[in-house]
């Protein structure tokens, strides 16, 4: 009766249990009754970094100088490419793609210490009383209005990102 | 693309003033934060100041303090630094950034030099 399921490392298809290419190789052909599954080693700039099927490896990641990127661990034929930034620059985001001079803050939170030489922008999140409605690299949290000493009430309350809203006071006739 | 063209560097004495300019292109200028950042020669980058969209809001380091003001016409697309009490150690290029500071974003810069 044919396998509905396999071990680890392997794959079904035409009702057998194929052996799944180690990390480094593609495959090249799925193995038979009387053949084993055929895997080639990727080429020189490509990778693959699991026990796969793919036909295909990946192309390693290009660190690109227009970007700020360089090379922090070149790739083998198991792993990828890994990019960091140039001196001073700072990595967008964890996949490095792309490089900033500083961080900004997003609204909601505010600027705790503003970049320097060797470190980046350290943001914190507006506590109540306190908003920013913009990104920014320099701007703390600002006050909410004080609806109070401009002899007005709150009409909207105030979040992390937005300042209160004031109206005037309802006058009894 | 974004361009930004940073000008009005040059030699001056001890004590004298400067104004750079930045001509900014590829962008809607009036929507964003607005840096100047100076390299000296031989060392790292340092944040010198900072304005807001609207200009109503700024940013100076310690070193430039009451030395240096940073203003914006938002209907010319151009940013500015006014430069007085020129000291020796203010010597370096000085670039012009838009938030949020990418790699490709960085103009030639203007160099600035305080020299007797």
């Known amino acids: 009766e044919p396998p509905t399921a396999c071990r680890e490392k392997q794959y079904l298809i035409n009702s057998q249990c194929c052996s799944l290419c180690q990390p480094g190789q593609k495959l090249v052909s799925d193995c038979t009754e009387f053949t084993e599954t055929e895997c080639l080693p990727c080429g020189e700039s490509e990778f693959l970094d699991t026990w796969n099927r793919e036909t295909h490896c990946h192309q390693h990641k290009y660190c690109d100088p227009n970007l700020g990127l360089r090379v922090q661990q070149k790739g083998t034929s198991e792993t990828d490419t890994i990019c960091t930034c140039e001196e001073g620059w700072h990595c967008t985001s964890e996949a490095c793609e792309s490089c900033v001079l500083h961080r900004s803050c997003s609204p909601g939170f505010g600027v705790k210490q503003i970049a320097t030489g060797v470190s980046d922008t350290i943001c914190e999140p507006c506590p109540v009383g306190f908003f920013s409605n913009v990104s920014s690299a320099f701007e703390k949290c600002h006050p909410w209005t004080s609806c109070e000493t401009k002899d007005l009430v709150v009409q909207q309350a105030g979040t992390n990102k937005t300042d209160v809203v004031c109206g005037p006071q309802d006058r009894l006739r | 693309e974004v361009q930004l063209l940073e000008s009005g560097g040059g030699l001056v004495q001890p004590g004298g003033s400067l104004r750079l300019s930045c001509a900014a292109s590829?962008?809607?200028?009036?929507?964003?934060e607005m840096w100047w950042v100076r390299q000296a020669p031989g060392k790292g980058l340092e944040r010198v100041s900072?304005?807001?969209?609207?200009?109503?809001?700024?940013y100076y380091a310690d070193s430039v303090k009451g030395r240096f003001t940073i203003s914006r016409d938002n209907s010319k697309n151009t940013l500015y630094l006014q430069m007085n009490s020129l000291r020796a150690e203010d010597t370096a290029v000085y670039y012009c950034?838009?938030?949020?500071?990418?790699?490709?974003?960085w103009g030639q810069g203007t160099l600035v030099t305080v020299s007797s």
């Open positions: 900072a304005i807001n969209p609207q200009g109503t809001r700024t």
């Open positions: 590829g962008f809607t200028f009036r929507d964003y």
């Open positions: 950034l838009k938030l949020p500071f990418t790699f490709e974003d």
